[in-house]
């Protein structure tokens, strides 16, 4: 428990400020699995990496939160970072 959360945080902390902003915008429209809701826009845009990690885990739980984070990273062209995140969660 907690490994996926740490991997999400590590990935988000490695984004530049511009990339973190882009991540949030993509998160607002990323396709979600059935049964999951979207993090409200107002809350999302002001969050730092730590707050965003906690919000992702509380909304989507660790496993799906990590998968969703990896997918948004891929949508941003950060496939290598996405792969590292998923590798860290499957150790």
């Amino acid at each position: 428990m907690g490994r996926a959360r740490d991997a999400i945080l590590d990935a988000l902390e490695n984004l530049t400020a511009e990339e973190l902003a882009a991540f949030k915008l993509k998160l607002l429209s990323v396709p979600l699995r059935e049964g999951y809701g979207r993090i409200p826009r107002g809350a999302l845009l002001s969050m730092d990496a730590l707050d965003l990690t906690d919000k992702l885990v509380s909304f989507y739980l660790e496993t799906y939160g990590a998968e969703l984070t990896a997918n948004v990273l891929r949508d941003m062209g950060l496939q290598e970072m996405a792969g590292q995140l998923q590798a860290a969660t499957h150790q």
Epitope: K26, P31, R74, D75, M76, G77, Q79, E80, G83
Partner: antibody, heavy 114, light 107 residues
């Protein structure tokens, strides 16, 4: 429809280099296509922050750069051989999700010949 | 590297036929597959992204499906202007890779 501008043709000698340009934005990919063959991804560059990714197959011969002031992406191809005669496309990823290549330049035809 | 295998290599068909093109990834790529159409002496054009999302302006006779490793592009009633090469590509991992293509020809 966004148009990616690329010069049409380049004729270069074996062993020489060529620098291809593409007016673009966001993530710009470079893709090689030999006559009658499939598509090969060379690499990409993010025009806003200069972040690059390379296909290891092309890392030694391709160098991706960007000029932010003119929104132009470049690829320098060095030590060219006849195997490098191909059409080189630039393409953008502008769709928000799944990172497809949605806008393509018309391609630059590079002929390597003495 | 992820290998994308397309089959068949070519297909001869008549106008109005239903066509199924297949693409197989060597490992799980989720839904990160796109389909491109390329006519002779032209640049590729995006048809489908995210395995099943039709790109802007693409006729609804083109449908994408599949996930993980197996993907299909269906053309419900082929028109003359659809005779072209079709490439699948994955954007799940670097390096991005494409299939060798399927050529649609007139019978």
């Amino acid at each position: 429809q966004v148009q990616l501008q690329q010069p049409g043709t380049e004729l270069v000698k074996p062993g020489a280099s060529v620098k291809l340009s593409c007016r673009a934005s966001g993530w710009t990919h470079w893709v090689k296509q030999r006559p009658g063959q499939g598509l090969e991804w060379i690499g990409n560059i993010n025009l806003s922050n200069g972040r690059t990714n390379y296909n290891e197959k092309f890392r030694a011969m391709a160098t991706l750069t960007v000029d932010k002031s003119s929104s132009t992406a470049y690829t320098q191809l060095s030590s060219l051989t006849s195997e490098d005669s191909a059409v080189y496309y630039c393409a953008n990823s502008m769709v928000p999700h799944f990172f497809p290549m949605d806008y393509w330049g018309q391609g630059t035809s590079v002929t390597v010949s003495s | 590297n992820i290998v994308m295998t397309q089959y068949p290599k070519s297909m001869s068909l008549s106008i109005g036929e239903r066509v199924t093109l297949r693409c197989k990834a060597s490992e799980n790529v989720g839904s990160y597959v796109s389909w491109y159409q390329q006519k002779p002496e032209q640049s590729p054009k995006l048809l489908i992204y995210g395995a099943s999302n039709r790109y802007t302006g693409v006729p609804d006779r083109f449908t994408g499906s599949g996930s993980a490793t197996d993907f299909i592009l269906t053309i419900t009633s082929v028109q003359a202007e659809d005779l072209a090469d079709y490439h699948c590509g994955q954007s799940y991992n670097y390096p991005l890779t494409f299939g060798a293509g399927t050529k649609l020809e007139l019978k």
